[in-house]
Interface confidence: low
């Protein structure tokens, strides 16, 4: 029996398709949404239990350039007293987000995509204890 | 755009900047980390400021499964595991970029996309504002 | 080169169970995500279920969540699909597929094995 054909526009390549090289894609790095912006509440790194710092990496040969990355300030947790609670832990939360890396080789460029993981904020959580026998 | 340092024997047709359009391996540096934040972490479950998980999927966007994370209270978990309402749990979010087929459909021509995603939940003490 | 043999199709009663496997050959199995698609009788191709290199991810079609089960043995180099409470409009030829690097574009596809529901 002949494989099939695929019917449905799911899998399908269309004609109008833009010719690429094997093993490569195109890619076009003007960002769809460029002008969308983070609508995230006042100040929540520093109202939070579990506070965190920014600090940009900076990347001339990565594109986005500017990455922000973030850094729990503490160990434990702040209370209701404003004292750090070592018996919580702040801990951080990660997102993965691709960027594109420029490499030269001699006069040569070329492109990867990469994806990095980028530290977004911080969370309080109960430990998980291990009881040793 | 962004200037780059160019060794000064090249030819001078390298663009300093990123061009609009590039021709990009197929293969993705760090493709194999984990991205089901179910598998990787339990923070979900045992934050003060919980959350759950919902699942995103668009085939003409890589990666085409994101996850999106839904505070579960208003207030925060406290020591004897209820709600309190003194405190607020709100979401994190992040900006991140994608790959959207562009043509749609087209299996190796994409274009950069920019989106917002909730990624967890944190406990803040509220913004308390006193009418006069 | 590269090859895919799927196994294990045949006729069941609706309610019932069967278990597909896919032995691949050719190439690095634990570098992509494999698929499984249908094509029912004089009907076009359906997504199924894919699953990721590493194992730590499955999609499933909304027709067949709950119901179905995609799994991989990167060692054996095989996948496989546990179809439970199966029903007439289940009844196909199920191919499994390999992935682009990039999903849901096939560049290899198995001979294929029929699955007949009915009572």
């Known amino acids: 029996r002949k494989i099939p054909k695929v019917g449905h526009t799911f899998f399908q390549k269309p004609e109008s398709c833009p010719p690429v090289p094997g093993g490569s894609m195109k890619l076009d790095i003007g960002i769809i949404n460029e002008n969308q912006r983070v609508s995230m509440s006042r100040n929540i790194e520093s109202r939070s239990t579990s506070p965190w710092n920014y600090t940009v990496t900076w990347d001339p040969n990565r594109y986005p350039s500017e990455v922000v990355q973030a850094q729990c300030r503490n160990l434990g947790c702040i209370n209701a007293q404003g004292k750090e609670d070592i018996s919580m832990n702040s801990v951080p939360i990660q997102q993965e987000t691709l960027v594109v890396r420029r490499k030269h080789q001699g006069c040569s460029v070329s492109f990867q995509l990469e994806k990095v993981l980028v530290t977004v904020g911080c969370t309080c959580v109960t430990p998980v204890i291990h009881h040793v026998q | 755009g962004i200037t780059i340092p160019r060794n000064p024997g090249c030819p001078n047709s390298e663009d300093k900047n990123f061009p609009r359009t590039v021709m990009v391996n197929l293969n993705i540096h760090n493709r194999n980390t984990n991205t089901n934040p179910k598998r990787s972490s339990d923070y979900y479950n045992r934050s003060t400021s919980p959350w759950n998980l919902h699942r995103n999927e668009d085939p003409e966007r890589y990666p085409s499964v994101i996850w999106e994370a839904k505070c579960r209270h208003l207030g925060c978990i406290n020591a004897d595991g209820n709600v309190d309402y003194h405190m607020n749990s709100v979401p994190i979010q992040q900006e991140i970029l994608v790959l959207r087929r562009e043509p749609p459909h087209c299996p190796n021509s994409f274009r950069l996309e920019k989106i917002l995603v909730s990624v967890g939940c944190t406990c803040v003490t509220p913004i308390v504002h006193h009418v006069a | 080169e590269v090859q895919l043999v799927e196994s294990g199709g045949g006729l069941v009663q609706p309610g019932g169970s069967l278990r597909l496997s896919c032995a691949a050959s050719g190439f690095t199995f634990s570098s992509y995500g494999m698929y499984w698609v249908r094509q029912a009788p004089g009907k076009g191709l359906e997504w199924v279920a894919k699953i990721e290199q590493d194992g730590s991810e499955e999609y499933y079609a909304d027709s067949v969540k709950g119901r179905f089960t995609i799994s991989r043995d990167n060692a054996k180099k095989s996948l496989y699909l546990q179809m439970n409470s199966l029903r007439a409009e289940d009844t196909a030829v199920y191919y499994c597929?390999?992935?682009?690097?990039?999903?849901?574009?096939?560049?290899?596809w198995g001979q294929g094995t029929l699955v007949t529901v009915s009572s």
């Open positions: 597929a390999k992935g682009e690097i990039l999903p849901l574009y096939f560049d290899y």
